[in-house]
Interface confidence: low
């Protein structure tokens, strides 16, 4: 999988868009999780709801909801008033029994509020994962990856 | 406590393929990368690429890719490095060290190393 | 790839002195999480490396206080404050902020 970046300024909503075969994925749940370290576990974050047909309904896990849209295809994930601490790797998943097939993986990045009159020599935080030759930014506000930067885990 | 044992000193012909094995005990061994260094005589550090043992992930250097070929054995915790059509400027030793990783914040440094693996490319 | 540049080349002390060795780097070593992965080796004739730095200024277990690293973004210093005969040697430099990982040419500290 090849990892998709997006851009949010802290303190605004993001949102993150995970499109997949309605027809492959047909009847399961969806996922949002947090990778652990570079290699490590993906810690569950919030899924879909338990009743399939109603993964409309927009679920919520603190500040972060999931949505999906099982015709067109379309796992929606919205991380509200995003914080330096969020910015990471993550992955979207679609469930089936026990197991957990990788929908896609994202790298959010937390842009300095560029009204915070603070330092904003550091607008870069935690995670990255895979080869990033491929990765894309879906985001307006985007940047170009360090050729050769390498997979790192969250920070805090 | 941490040990990396390397095989022992080679003595190859030029155009020959070789393999190196670097046998890892006291640590989680699958899930920490094995990197593998090289050294000529009186020279440098060269890396020449990492293993992550518990899914085969690999990077390498751009000039050992071709050559170059790094496996790992989870059940016997051994790292290897092969190496394919030897020329006198492999002639050198290599160095497996294992990639120090303490989150949160992970150093990424190398912390242990085996202690080398001589070879000589000769005919 | 990123090149780690080490003066000077050879560095010739005393007993007592203090040991100063930079690194510098062509491109800044601070990765996008912000942490800077810029480390520092000791290898003692015959011996493996020995990692003394990590991540610029963080100590390796038991190594001693005498050494320290300093720096930011593409130059970084290693210091030995009181030279000992233990830490002759060469020392090296080197970053993994990106692939491939890249080690200065070294710094051999001898007796003067």
């Known amino acids: 999988h090849n990892t998709t970046v997006f851009q949010g300024v802290a303190g605004q909503s993001l949102q993150v868009s995970c499109p997949y075969d309605s027809m492959a994925h047909w009847g399961r749940r969806k996922a949002w999780c947090r990778q652990l370290g570079e290699k490590g576990p993906c810690q569950r974050v919030v899924s879909t709801h338990n009743l399939w047909l109603l993964s409309f309904l927009r679920r919520w896990n603190g500040s972060t909801a999931i949505t999906d849209d099982t015709l067109g295809g379309t796992l929606t994930i919205t991380l509200r008033n995003l914080q330096p601490h969020d910015a990471g790797l993550y992955q979207c998943q679609s469930l089936h029994g026990s197991e957990a097939d990788t929908l896609r993986k994202v790298l959010v990045e937390v842009l300095a509020d560029p009204l915070d009159h603070r330092d904003a020599g550091d607008l870069w935080f935690p995670g990255e994962s895979e080869s990033f030759e491929d990765a894309h930014v879906e985001h307006s506000i985007s940047r170009s990856l360090l050729e050769g930067e390498i997979p790192f885990p969250p920070t805090s | 406590q941490v040990q990396l044992q390397q095989s022992g000193p080679e003595l190859v012909k030029p155009g020959a393929s070789l393999k190196i094995s670097c046998k890892a005990s006291?640590?989680?061994?699958?899930?920490?990368?094995m990197n593998w260094v090289k050294q000529r005589p009186g020279k440098g550090l060269e890396w020449i690429g990492r293993?992550?043992?518990?899914?085969?992930?690999?990077n390498y250097n751009g000039e050992f890719r071709v050559r170059a070929t790094l496996t790992a054995d989870t059940s016997s915790t051994t790292a290897y490095m092969q190496l394919s059509s030897l020329t006198s400027e492999d002639s050198a030793v290599y160095f497996c060290?294992?990639?120090?990783?303490?989150?949160?914040?992970?150093?990424?440094?190398?912390?242990?190393w085996g202690q080398g693996a001589s070879v000589t490319v000769s005919s | 790839d990123v090149v780690m540049t080490q003066t000077p080349l050879s560095l010739p002390v005393s007993l007592g002195d203090q040991a100063s060795i930079s690194c510098r780097s062509s491109?800044?070593?601070?990765?996008?999480?912000?942490?800077?992965?810029l480390h520092w080796y000791l290898q003692k004739p015959g011996q493996s490396p020995k990692l003394l730095i990590y991540?610029?200024?963080n100590r390796f277990s038991g190594v001693p206080d005498r050494f320290s690293g300093s720096g930011s973004g593409t130059d970084f210093t290693l210091k030995i404050s009181r030279v000992e005969a233990d830490d002759l040697g060469v020392y090296f430099c080197?970053?993994?902020?990106?692939?491939?990982?890249?080690f200065g040419g070294g710094t051999k500290l001898e007796i003067k």
């Open positions: 060290a294992r990639l120090l990783r303490n989150q949160p914040g992970e150093s990424y440094a190398m912390d242990y």
């Open positions: 006291g640590y989680a061994f699958s899930s920490s990368w």
């Open positions: 293993i992550y043992p518990g899914d085969g992930d690999t």
């Open positions: 491109q800044s070593l601070v990765h996008s999480n912000g942490y800077t992965y």
């Open positions: 991540k610029v200024s």
């Open positions: 080197s970053q993994s902020t990106r692939v491939p990982y890249t």
